[in-house]
Interface confidence: medium
């Protein structure tokens, strides 16, 4: 015997109080699959969250973060304050990267400049708070005709995590 609820499409629920009739989801709720016995409450985007996608009868709302914050975690489970390039977020707020470190993003932590001398290279462009050092050829390679330049190592993307 087929379950009558299996005929209820997304956006409805199988209403046990009304002989298992398919009733539309009430306001501020949704069902993303058929055959549901209840509708789920829509996510609200409050505080430093803002609405990226409105809730519909078949899909939940989606939030992102207000300007000055960025999302953390799957589905933007929380928001974290942005800093400027050349800064990192500390317990005292946004602080400039210490000498010898850089951050080329608005989030994450300051990373050490590439140490060109470790690879036997010369420094082609000095590091700044916002950018890594660029290594040039090794002194031994600076003979006439040598012109290769090592591209800078990509900045590591710091891991972000939910609460």
């Amino acid at each position: 015997l087929q379950d009558p609820c299996s005929n209820c499409p997304a956006g409805t629920f199988c209403d046990n109080n009304r002989n298992q009739i398919c009733s539309p989801c009430p306001p501020n709720s949704f069902s993303s699959a058929g055959g549901q016995r209840t509708c789920d409450i829509c996510r609200q985007c409050k505080g430093v969250f803002r609405t990226r996608k409105e809730c519909s009868s078949t899909s939940n709302a989606e939030c992102d973060c207000t300007p000055g914050f960025h999302c953390l975690g799957a589905g933007c489970s929380m928001c974290e304050q942005d800093c400027k390039q050349g800064q990192e977020l500390t317990k005292q707020g946004c602080k400039d990267c210490r000498f010898g470190t850089f951050n080329d993003q608005k989030r994450g932590i300051c990373q050490p400049w590439t140490n060109c001398s470790l690879d036997g290279k010369s420094v082609l462009v000095n590091g700044t708070k916002e950018s890594d050092a660029v290594c040039g050829p090794s002194p031994a390679d600076l003979s006439p005709g040598a012109s290769s330049v090592t591209p800078p190592a990509p900045a590591r993307e710091p891991g972000h995590s939910p609460q």
């Epitope: 409450i41 996510r43 609200q44 409050k46 505080g47 430093v48 969250f49 939030c63 973060c65 914050f69 953390l72 975690g73 799957a74 589905g75 933007c76 489970s77 929380m78 928001c79 974290e80 304050q81 990192e88 977020l89 500390t90 317990k91 994450g108 932590i109 710091p158 891991g159 972000h160 995590s161 939910p162 609460q163």
Partner: antibody
């Protein structure tokens, strides 16, 4: 299942130091912000500190700023709270917690008692 | 940070409805959670995101939040509901704030 187990509490004199630990299991520890919350005897809950999953970002309540340091060792699935310059008013049960955020559950340890007294 | 104010105590007869308030400046623009704490135990989340119940929490617990007041409502209060209740506000970012707590007595 998620488990949080605090340790390191005890009796300490005013001005002294203590380090609390919280051993976590049952979830990917490094994916989550972790909190310390305390409760003085017969009083309410007070949020103390939080640390990001990577350990790079930390935040503190004004009442402990400059005296307490939160840290974590993701290789050991352990959260820490280093408490220095302790005062009588720091006497409390200290809970380690993974507090609710959107899509994420809420879990607390059983707490460890810190008593600051001479 | 927002300051959350709760009544120190609320009394209710068994089977009646208990309402515990949590007031704070424009608290309706933030998320409110409610915790139940029994003596010697860690707090237990009973309401999150203003009005949602975690699995395992009885349907008699409900929440609302608008303007400057959030409310925890316990319908058909039972003796086992006697406990301390704390509200907590969260704006989606990092830190948290707790209310002072309310002792619920079931007469």
């Amino acid at each position: 299942q998620v488990q949080l187990v605090e340790s390191g509490g005890g009796l300490v004199q005013p001005g002294g130091s203590l380090r609390l630990s919280c051993a976590a299991s049952g979830f990917t520890f490094s994916d989550y912000y972790m909190h310390w919350v305390r409760q003085a005897p017969g009083k309410g809950l007070e949020w103390v500190s939080v640390i990001s999953g990577s350990g790079s970002n930390t935040y503190y309540a004004d009442s402990v700023k400059g005296r307490f340091t939160i840290s974590r060792d993701n290789s050991k699935n352990t959260l820490y709270l280093q408490m220095n310059s302790l005062r009588a008013e720091d006497t409390a049960v200290y809970y380690c917690a993974r507090l609710y955020a959107q899509f994420e559950g809420d879990f607390w340890g059983q707490g460890t008692l810190v008593t600051v007294s001479s | 940070d927002i300051e959350l104010t709760q009544p120190p105590s609320v009394s209710v007869a068994p089977g009646q409805t208990a309402r515990i308030s949590c007031s704070g400046d424009n608290i309706g623009s933030k998320y409110v959670s409610w915790y139940q704490q029994k003596p010697g135990q860690a707090p237990v989340l009973v309401i999150y995101s203003d009005s949602e119940r975690p699995s395992g929490i009885p349907e008699r617990f409900s929440g609302s939040n608008s303007g400057n007041t959030a409310t925890l409502t316990i319908s058909g209060t039972q003796a086992e509901d006697e406990a301390d209740y704390y509200c907590q506000s969260w704006d989606g970012s990092i830190s948290r704030v707790f209310g002072g707590g309310t002792k619920l007595t079931v007469l």
